[in-house]
Interface confidence: low
Amino acid sequence: FERTRSLQDPCSNCPAGTFCDNNRNQICSPCPPNSFSSAGGQRTCDICRQCKGVFRTRKECSSTSNAECDCTPGFHCLGAGCSMCEQDCKQGQELTKKGCKDCCFGTFNDQKRGICRPWTNCSLDGKSVLVNGTKERDVVCGPSPADLSPGASSVTPPAPAREPGHSPQ
């Protein structure tokens, strides 16, 4: 066991927050300011991410973990680890290359991000439109026309609006 240990890479003893300094006989040196190492045995420390410009700091960098960024008001995160910030639009709009544009008739967007999506087609479920759709809201489907014939009970509550799809945005 001792023999195995002696053959080990001496750098493997350096904990997170340090690096194995080849210039100092492989001593474990603390990461310099504005750098970090999140795992042990590192030969260098990584430079901390800086949340600049449209990014703002969500979590400060420490010697063992990188900073985390989110976006300033009016923007939202895109990409893994908030690698990009994309401009917010208003509800009822979508972001195009030419900026925020209103949803076309027959589509809606109830969020400040993402794309306009088509209104639910109530007739596919044999239902009728109870509340018309807008640029900001999907239609609300109600009972089928047959259910509303004279004498028929109409106490059934309308179906909830369709849950917006969670496609990547």
Epitope: C48, R49, Q50, K52, G53
Partner: antibody, heavy 119, light 106 residues
């Protein structure tokens, strides 16, 4: 000393492909917090940012003019950055510079490699 | 995308002149504005970063100022080696460049 040396440029027909390389020395391409990428300059024109890749390699960025046609990648073992150029057009004719971006400013530039798209 | 507009597009000046180049952004970019010098057949060289910080090794006759949407590069006393094209670049959101300002000998 930080150095970036591009290669791979040349004459190619419209619709053709090329792969540009950028050999880095004096720093590691995989250093966190350092992005590297490509900027081009058409003959007699200004500078246009083309593409970038984050230090951790997890994020790639492209200008709208090249999205879907160009692919940026790197080989950490060779400390080399690549730009694969597909479906080339006459308007892609330019000197392509490899750059290192230190949180915004492009602090280091290669000497450039000329890509000419012509039939 | 953020657009940068440089003015003038070219200017003629003499050695010893004070030269001012402006760069206007289409939206606020706080101070994330950088300046480069490019000579024919050469790669651009970083002069000023984050609006007003002089890059190491750049002569002190170069200075930068501004914030928000309006920025200025000033050469206090033009030297023969300063005749070149100058570009501004924003690093607030991705990276875009101004169209350049060519400084020529009068």
């Amino acid at each position: 000393e930080v150095q970036l040396v591009e290669s791979g440029g040349g004459l190619v027909q419209p619709g053709g492909s090329l792969r540009l390389s950028c050999a880095a020395s004096g720093f590691s391409l995989s250093t966190g917090g350092v992005a590297v990428g490509w900027i081009r300059q058409a003959p007699g024109k200004g500078l246009e940012w083309v593409s970038g890749i984050s230090g951790d390699g997890g994020t790639t960025y492209y200008a709208d003019s090249v999205k879907g046609r160009f692919t940026i990648s790197r080989d950490n073992s060779k400390n080399t950055l690549y730009l694969q150029l597909n479906s080339l057009r006459a308007e892609d004719t330019a000197v392509y510079y490899c750059t290192r971006e230190d949180y915004g400013p492009h602090a280091y530039w290669g000497q450039g490699t000329l890509v000419t798209v012509s039939s | 995308d953020i657009q940068l507009t440089q003015s003038p597009s070219s200017l003629s000046a003499s050695v010893g002149d004070r030269v001012t180049i402006t760069c206007r952004a289409s939206q606020s970019i706080t101070t994330y504005l950088n300046w480069y010098q490019q000579k024919p057949g050469k790669a651009p060289k970083l002069l000023i970063y984050d609006a007003s910080n002089l890059e190491t090794g750049v002569p002190s006759r170069f200075s930068g100022s501004g914030s928000g949407t309006d920025f200025t590069l000033t050469i206090s006393s033009l030297q023969p080696e300063d005749f070149a094209t100058y570009y501004c670049q924003q690093s607030y959101s991705y990276s875009t460049f101004g169209q350049g300002t060519k400084v020529e000998i009068k």
